[in-house]
């Protein structure tokens, strides 16, 4: 019997300080470039080595960015989202959604370390 793949979704506020080479990450997504099916949201595609995001350590590739400095990223064209980041100033506050994959065992199987109930 195959295990079920579930996702644990958490949100986090990440405050970054723009470094000498900027914020140090790439994005995909937007209304004109859907990266996830039926979702025009903005996703982190690359974290650049030694950049501000990498040094901070909290932002991860695959994270969905919900807002920048309180401004919602819903229903934005890709380039408009890029411009929003570029014009976000020195101190940048990101509201992000982490989606962690949780591998569950077959139904009826209790993995090691699971509470016995």
């Amino acid at each position: 019997m195959n295990g079920r793949v579930d996702y644990l979704v958490t949100e986090e506020e990440i405050n970054l300080t723009r470094g000498p080479s900027g914020l140090g990450f790439n994005i995909v997504g937007g209304t004109d470039q859907q990266y996830v099916s039926n979702d025009s949201g903005i996703y982190v595609s690359r974290i650049k080595e030694n950049g501000a995001a990498a040094l901070d350590g909290r932002l991860q590739e695959g994270d969905k960015i919900l807002s920048v400095n309180g401004q919602d990223l819903k229903n934005l064209l890709h380039q408009d989202a890029v411009d929003l980041f570029r014009n976000a100033g020195y101190a940048v506050s990101l509201r992000v959604q982490h989606r962690l994959q949780v591998q569950n065992g077959p139904i009826g199987h209790r993995g090691e370390g699971d509470p016995s109930g």
């Epitope: 900027g22 914020l23 990450f25 790439n26 690359r46 890029v82």
Partner: nanobody, 125 residues
Framework: QVQLVESGGGLVQPGGSVRVSCVSS????????IGWFRQAPGKEREGVSC???????YYVDSVKGRFTISRDNAKNTVYLQMNSLKPEDTAVYYC????????????????????WGQGTQVTVS
Amino acid sequence: QVQLVESGGGLVQPGGSVRVSCVSSGFILDYYAIGWFRQAPGKEREGVSCIDSVGRAYYVDSVKGRFTISRDNAKNTVYLQMNSLKPEDTAVYYCAADFGSSVDSTCLNNRQYDYWGQGTQVTVS
């Protein structure tokens, strides 16, 4: 494994044309920015043209109106058509790929790229 292979360079007369190609493998072009860069002997590598992940093209001033970048996602290939070539266009031409759009700089910035081809020589003489 990501791989970029350039082809199509060679010896061209001043005023002539050439098209260089960059074929990618190991990834789907759709979400990638692709840049063309060149390096002449004794000089630093410089951005020439690029096309971002949504198809917007950029050019440095020295090639505007002479060079045209295009992409064929179905063939996983990006082309750089170079017309009205000048001796100063002589260089090794490299293509590079980057996943998504940098939030820091346009795709003409070579520091943003993770993947590079081996280059193809274009000599205008």
